[in-house]
């Protein structure tokens, strides 16, 4: 994938950030040991990775969270990797589900998602979780990225 | 990523190995169905993958472990993917945390880490865990690798 | 990895499908937001990804399942990524193991496998699980794919 000017490498890796927003969409930042290869991929509004070129991308996310079964709803903790293409509805690409831990006050678990998808110019990918307050933002625990094949 | 002589493929996949060392750094071997594309990536001292060329790499690790909540410390099992660049301090790239299982004698869990990072010539990556004695070394359970974009 | 005609991109991402078959090999389909780059990788019999060209491939699988400790055997839930090369025995490339949850009626967990492997022309990869009836087939929960480096 070392390429000439016409086919530059396109890759990103961004780091989770705590947010006061009440949305289920996780927030990310270009901080720590992040990757942003060039302006053909950008982090928009701290919430989505947007690509300028059509093609196949390996997209991944990792989410670490701490939750407790008795204190949570019966539904599991779910992390979803979602796609918004221009002029299209949002759609789910990947999901992972982990039942809450019985550990008190909470038990930590890590989820990893990854897959190869065709993205259109201007397409954005983002990560949804059932409860953002449970997500771990310590160094390296929660991250999100992609690479163009 | 099929490349000419100037841009050879660079990739590695190594297999976990039980060790009598008391270090928290996992040990690896070129055994079984391993991958070592060429001498531009090497396994050093059985513990770290070292690259000769600068660039973006997708680096991953998988760790399966068996632990029990009562027999372990309160802290969760943590696997860390770490980077040591020449003349720099070590740093954590990725971490995953799983609270110990209540299953007896121990409950198995698998962790997967992966992300895109810029590596300098001579940079090494390695995997740390909180308790190496809990790691599963059966075929395919615990492995470590990278590929150059 | 944008390549000329001689080096086309090769990638696949297929979606899990419930099956009445009693085999432990998971079934997949080209449905939903799937990827099949060209005829250099094919889904055969709904169960295996087969490649026409030799080379290094990053192969991955994600399996979400719902199980209960009391209702299951003592053995953990195991997902295995397996390889069948022409004229060779099957072999395990990667495995992950998760002990069954104590949640009732069942607790969901997600497993992710991924690694870089050399494949021969005509080689096939497939995914085995200990109990296919426990696998979640909701949108995005269980998928399987590869990309050629």
């Amino acid at each position: 994938m070392q390429k000439g000017d016409q086919n530059p490498q396109i890759a990103a890796h961004v780091i989770s950030e705590a947010s006061s927003k009440t949305t289920s969409v996780l927030q990310w930042a270009e901080k720590g040991y992040y990757t942003m290869s060039n302006n053909l991929v950008t982090l928009e509004n701290g919430k989505q990775l947007t690509v300028k070129r059509q093609g196949l991308y390996y997209i991944y996310a990792q989410v670490t969270f701490c939750s407790n079964r008795e204190a949570s709803s019966q539904a599991p903790f779910i992390a979803s990797l979602c796609l918004k293409s221009p002029g299209r509805f949002e759609r789910i690409l990947l999901r992972a589900a982990n039942t809450h831990s019985s550990a008190k006050p909470c038990g930590q678990q890590s989820i990893h998602l990854g897959g190869v998808f065709e993205l259109q110019p201007g397409a954005s990918v983002f990560v949804n979780v059932t409860d953002p307050s449970q997500v771990s933002h310590g160094t390296g625990f929660t991250s999100f990225g992609l690479l163009k094949l | 990523m099929q490349k000419g002589d100037q841009n050879p493929q660079i990739a590695a996949h190594v297999i976990s190995e039980a060790s009598s060392k008391t270090t928290s750094v996992l040990q690896w071997a070129e055994k079984g169905y391993y991958t070592m594309s060429n001498n531009l990536v090497t396994l050093e001292n059985g513990k770290q993958l070292t690259v000769k060329r600068q660039g973006l790499y997708y680096i991953y690790a998988q760790v399966t472990f068996c632990s029990n909540r009562e027999a372990s410390s309160q802290a969760p099992f943590i696997a860390s993917l770490c980077l040591k660049s020449p003349g720099r301090f070590e740093r954590i790239l990725l971490r995953a945390a799983n609270t110990h299982s209540s299953a007896k004698p121990c409950g198995q869990q698998s962790i997967h880490l992966g992300g895109v990072f810029e590596l300098q010539p001579g940079a090494s990556v390695f995997v740390n865990v909180t308790d190496p004695s809990q790691v599963s070394h059966g075929t395919g359970f615990t492995s470590f690798g990278l590929l150059k974009l | 990895m944008q390549k000329g005609d001689q080096n086309p991109q090769i990638a696949a991402h297929v979606i899990s499908e419930a099956s009445s078959k009693t085999t432990s090999v998971l079934q997949w389909a080209e449905k939903g937001y799937y990827t099949m780059s060209n005829n250099l990788v094919t889904l055969e019999n709904g169960k295996q990804l087969t490649v026409k060209r030799q080379g290094l491939y990053y192969i991955y699988a994600q399996v979400t399942f719902c199980s209960n400790r009391e209702a299951s055997s003592q053995a953990p839930f195991i997902a295995s990524l397996c390889l069948k090369s022409p004229g060779r025995f099957e072999r395990i490339l990667l495995r992950a193991a998760n002990t069954h949850s104590s949640a009732k009626p069942c607790g969901q967990q997600s497993i992710h496998l991924g690694g870089v492997f050399e494949l021969q022309p005509g080689a096939s990869v497939f995914v085995n699980v200990t109990d296919p009836s426990q696998v979640s087939h909701g949108t995005g929960f269980t998928s399987f794919g590869l990309l050629k480096l």
Epitope: A18, C66, P105, C106, H137 | - | -
Partner: nanobody, 116 residues
Framework: EVQLVESGGGLVQPGGSLRLSCAAS????????MGWFRQAPGKEREFVAA????????QYADSVKGRFTISADNSKNTAYLQMNSLKPEDTAVYYC?????????WGQGTLVTVSS
Amino acid sequence: EVQLVESGGGLVQPGGSLRLSCAASGRIFSTYFMGWFRQAPGKEREFVAAIYWSNGKTQYADSVKGRFTISADNSKNTAYLQMNSLKPEDTAVYYCAAWLNGGNRWGQGTLVTVSS
């Protein structure tokens, strides 16, 4: 940086009561729970009680159920532990703990001594 500050510890006779407070300060974006752990001399730190911000649910260690009550004032980012019917075996350093801004935070601890 987020800080947790405990208060309310002290010496009390068996059967007596104490109320501990834990105040969180700093830029707090999200809170999952606030709670208490304790560590008696020569023993491991153990969970006591927790209250979960989103739904007000509470959890207790079996050893304190029916005697201790945890509550919170969300607007002040403060949790309280009302300890009744105290026993000598409740003697310990009590640590406030919280999952704030996506990380586990700890207070410095406050000593509770139950003795006649």
